[in-house]
């Protein structure tokens, strides 16, 4: 069965490295579920659309999430 169609966690590696919010195209947060017991954060970078899994426990990534949500709240009326 192809991986992309199996209902399991999809992140093979995770990054603890800081990500510049300006270089982000998209940030997907997949909540924990019965199929995957952990939160998965998938960052799509503007350059070449490369996707990386981020470590939700990393301080740098928590700061990134704060920065992104702050930016979103600024934009929303």
């Amino acid at each position: 069965v192809p991986l992309s169609r199996t209902v399991r966690c999809t992140c093979i590696s995770i990054s603890n490295q800081p990500v510049n919010p300006r270089s982000l195209e998209k940030l997907e947060i997949i909540p924990a579920s019965q199929f995957c017991p952990r939160v998965e954060i998938i960052a799509t970078m503007k350059k070449k659309g490369e996707k990386r899994c981020l470590n939700p426990e990393s301080k740098a990534i928590k700061n990134l999430l704060k920065a992104v949500s702050k930016e979103r709240s600024k934009r929303s009326p």
């Epitope: 192809p2 991986l3 992309s4 399991r8 966690c9 999809t10 992140c11 093979i12 590696s13 995770i14 990054s15 603890n16 017991p37 952990r38 998938i42 070449k48 490369e50 996707k51 990386r52 899994c53 470590n55």
Partner: antibody, heavy 121, light 108 residues
């Protein structure tokens, strides 16, 4: 320095078992998925198996499913490949390789020097 | 399953440019990664995402990818460039990494 060192290869009879190990150093092992890739003598590279950073997800090439088991011990920075019911076509140099960290586009940014497994009667 | 086709061998004189092709249907839609394997050694990643170079890889090595062919180009070839070169992609239909058969580069 950043490196991977495989061990455990050798000559084994068909149907027998062997366990390979790969010791990692110089990087945060527990953040990376790890792969086994093999190369039969004089042939090209073939991906064999991967295990996620936390050990929860494992995937295999069809030809080894049910016979090989990939595992890891993050406290020891070590990757393993348990190979059962070995066949002559499993004869190869086995490399452990670090996942690049890309999401659903696996490639390998660090390789060990490999360990030779010979299956012969 | 996605198939990658490489020429078995490429020969080039020192100082000249070597081009190693990797063919596959619409490979330009995929990301291609390249590995160099010198005799008796482990493979080394030399190009990722079609054209990016890991640190420590000389600028003489470059990559491109469009249509049905990806190409690894080695300019000003040196004797130390001899070895086998493998292209690799992620095959989304089988969800696994796939390697080309490899190309042996000989420096004349």
């Amino acid at each position: 320095q950043v490196q991977l060192v495989e061990s455990g290869g050798g000559v084994v009879q068909p149907g027998r078992s062997l366990r390979l190990s790969c010791a990692a150093s110089g990087f945060t092992f527990s953040s990376y998925g790890m792969h086994w890739v093999r190369q039969a003598p004089g042939k090209g590279l073939e991906w064999v198996a991967v295990i996620s950073y936390d050990g929860n997800n494992k995937y295999y090439v069809d030809s080894v499913k049910g016979r090989f088991t990939i595992s890891r011990d993050n406290s020891k920075n070590t990757l393993y490949l348990q190979m059962n019911s070995l066949r002559s076509e499993d004869t190869a140099v086995y490399y452990c390789a670090r996942d690049s960290g890309s999401y659903l586009d696996w490639y390998f940014d660090l390789w060990g020097r490999g360990t030779l497994v010979t299956v012969s009667s | 399953n996605f198939m990658l086709t490489q020429p078995p061998s490429v020969s080039v004189a020192p100082g000249k440019t070597a081009r190693i092709a990797c063919g596959g249907g619409n490979i330009g839609d995929k990301s291609v990664h390249w590995y160099q394997q010198k005799p008796g050694q482990a493979p080394v990643l030399v190009i990722f995402y079609d054209s990016d170079r890991p640190s420590g890889i000389p600028k003489r090595l470059s990559g491109s990818n469009s249509g049905n062919t990806a190409t690894l180009t080695i300019s000003r070839v040196e004797a130390g460039d001899e070895g086998d070169y493998y292209c690799q992609v992620w095959d989304s239909s089988s969800d696994r990494p796939v390697f080309g058969g490899g190309t042996k580069l000989t420096v004349l």
